[in-house]
Amino acid sequence: SSPTSSASSFSSSAPFLASAVSAQPPLPDQCPALCECSEAARTVKCVNRNLTEVPTDLPAYVRNLFLTGNQLAVLPAGAFARRPPLAELAALNLSGSRLDEVRAGAFEHLPSLRQLDLSHNPLADLSPFAFSGSNASVSAPSPLVELILNHIVPPEDERQNRSFEGMVVAALLAGRALQGLRRLELASNHFLYLPRDVLAQLPSLRHLDLSNNSLVSLTYVSFRNLTHLESLHLEDNALKVLHNGTLAELQGLPHIRVFLDNNPWVCDCHMADMVTWLKETEVVQGKDRLTCAYPEKMRNRVLLELNSADLDCDPILPPSLQTS
C-alpha cells in the first residue's frame, strides 16, 4: 500500500482526521496494508493486526468494516471521517480492540452506519456524545439500528468514580439520537440496575439483551413504551421475583418473547403472582426450566409445578422474640 489516503472531512468536530490527507491523489479503492478487502462483498477486514489507529486509506466502497482484535485504545472525534465520506459504511465491528476511550463524535460522518459492535472493550471512558456526536439537547438522528455493547465493563480497578450503568445510559440517551435503535445488546456488563428512563427513550427497540448482568429487580423499569419489543433477554441475572406491574407490562407487549433462565428465584409468598402468571402466559420462553434457588427447602423446584401452599413466608417475629 502506498502512503496515500482518502482525504478526511474538514469538519471542526473531526479534527483528528483533518490531517489524514494524501500527498497525491488517492488511489480510489486501494486496500490498506494489513487488511483484506473484497470489493465484491464491499468488505474490509483488518483483524488481529495490532493496529493502534483506524486505517486512513479505507476504500470508499466499504460497507462492512471489521477492525476486531486490535489495540486501538482510543477513538477520537471523527475517527472514521473521510473526504469523500465513507458513505456506504453500514456495519462496523470494533470488538476486542482494547478500546478504553470513545470520544464525542467518534462515529460522525458515517451517514449509513446501521450496525456498530463495541463488545469486549473495557470502556472506562465512553463519552455521553459518542453516538450522538454533539452536546445539543436534541441531536440529528443517528442511523444506528443495531448497537452491540456486550462485555464493555472495564476491570474494577479501571472504573472511574461514577456509575458504569449511568455512563452507558448517558451515551444511549444523549440528544435522543438513538430513537431508531432496534437492537441493543448490553450483556455481561455487571449491571446492578437499569436506570428507569432508558427504555422509555428507545421506543423502536425490537431486541434487548441484558443477559449475564447482576440485575436484582425490575421494579422501577417500565417496558410499557416498548410496543415493538420482540425479545427480552434477562437470563443469568440476579432476579428474585417479578412483581405484578412488570408482569402486566410484559403481558401487554404484543410480540414479546422473554428469556428468564438461570436467575436465583426466591420461592416464597412474594412469588405467588409470578407463578400464576407463568402458568398462563405464552411470552416466557423455556418457562418449564425456571427453578427456585431460595429458600433452601425449595431449591431446584420447578416454578410451574408450585402451588400457593408451597409459597409461604416465615412470619416476622416481634423484636422481643427475635434471637440473634
Epitope: 500500500s1 502512503p3 496515500t4 489516503s5 479534527p15 483528528f16 482526521l17 483533518a18 490531517s19 489524514a20 494524501s22 490498506p32 496494508a33 494489513l34 487488511c35 483488518c46 493486526r49 495490532n50 493496529l51 493502534t52 489507529e53 483506524v54 486505517p55 486512513t56 486509506d57 489495540q71 485504545a73 482510543v74 477520537p76 472525534a77 478504553d100 476511550e101 470520544r103 472506562a124 471512558d125 479501571e158 472511574q160
Partner: antibody, heavy 120, light 111 residues
C-alpha cells in the same frame, strides 16, 4: 541500544525536492509508529508527519500537507520523507522519532537530525 | 489546533534549588483514561529527550529529581534539586489529537 540515523538533508532551491531517510536499529522497527519532527533554526519543535507501524495510517501537519509524503520499508528498517515543492520555511533540522501509538504514544527515541536548507 | 503555552520563557535557578516550569493547553488534554501530555529536554546541539510521559510518568533512565503533575489544561514539570547537567530547553507536548503540538519551550539556566 535504540538508534535512529537520519540522512538526505542538504541545500535545495525553493520548489525543489529532497528525500530524507531514517535508518533504525536496536529495536523491532515493524512494531512502532514513526514520526518526523522538525526544528527551524533557533526555534521550537514542530510535528510534521506520522506513519503507523504497518503503514495503515498516515498523518500530516497542515503546513506540509500535499507536499510531503511519509513512507516506510519495514524489511529495510527504514523510514522516509519525500519533500516536494520545498519552501524557505521548510528550512530546519528534521528528526525521526519512534512511538508506540499516535495518540497514546510519545516520542521516546530520537535521531540526531539531518539539516535541510531551502534557499536560492 | 490545540495551543500549548509554557511559562516562563526562560528561568534561572541556583544549583540545588527547585525549578518549576508550567504548561497550559488551550483545551483539556486529559480523559478519565489517560493524560495526553508529555515533557522533553533538549540540550544544545542535541535532539530532544523524553523525560515524562502522560503528565506524571518518569521515563526509564531519567533521574527522579524530575517529576510531572497536572491534568486537564494545566501541567507542571518540577526539578527538585537543579544540577548543572539540567541546563537545557524544556518542551511540553500534547497527543490529544492531530496535529500534535509542542509548547514554545522554556530555557533553564543556572543562576
Amino acid at each position: 541500544e535504540v538508534q535512529l540515523v537520519e540522512s538526505g538533508g542538504g541545500l535545495v532551491q525553493p520548489g525543489g525536492s529532497l528525500r530524507l531517510s531514517c535508518a533504525a536499529s536496536g529495536f523491532t522497527f515493524s512494531n512502532f509508529g514513526m514520526h518526523w519532527v522538525r526544528q527551524a533554526p533557533g526555534k521550537g519543535l514542530e510535528w510534521v508527519s506520522y506513519i503507523s507501524s504497518g503503514s495503515t495510517s498516515f498523518y500530516y501537519a497542515d503546513t506540509v500537507k500535499g507536499r510531503f509524503t511519509i513512507s516506510r520499508d519495514n524489511a529495510k528498517n527504514s523510514l522516509y520523507l519525500q519533500m516536494n515543492s520545498l519552501r524557505d520555511e521548510d528550512t530546519a533540522v528534521y528528526y525521526c522519532s519512534r512511538t508506540n501509538s499516535l495518540l497514546r504514544g510519545f516520542f521516546d527515541a530520537w535521531g540526531q537530525g539531518t539539516t535541510v536548507t531551502v534557499s536560492s | 489546533d490545540i495551543v500549548m503555552t509554557q511559562s516562563p520563557d526562560s528561568l534561572a535557578v541556583s544549583l540545588g534549588e527547585r525549578a518549576t516550569i508550567n504548561c497550559r493547553a488551550s483545551q483539556s488534554v486529559s480523559s478519565s483514561s489517560y493524560t495526553y501530555l508529555h515533557w522533553y529536554q533538549q540540550k544544545p546541539g542535541q535532539p530532544p529527550k523524553l523525560l515524562i510521559y502522560s503528565a506524571s510518568n518518569l521515563e526509564s533512565g531519567v533521574p527522579d529529581r524530575f517529576s510531572g503533575s497536572g491534568s486537564g489544561t494545566d501541567f507542571t514539570l518540577t526539578i527538585s534539586s537543579l544540577q548543572a547537567e539540567d541546563v537545557a530547553v524544556y518542551y511540553c507536548q500534547h497527543s490529544w489529537e492531530i496535529p500534535l503540538t509542542f509548547g514554545q519551550g522554556t530555557k533553564l539556566e543556572i543562576k
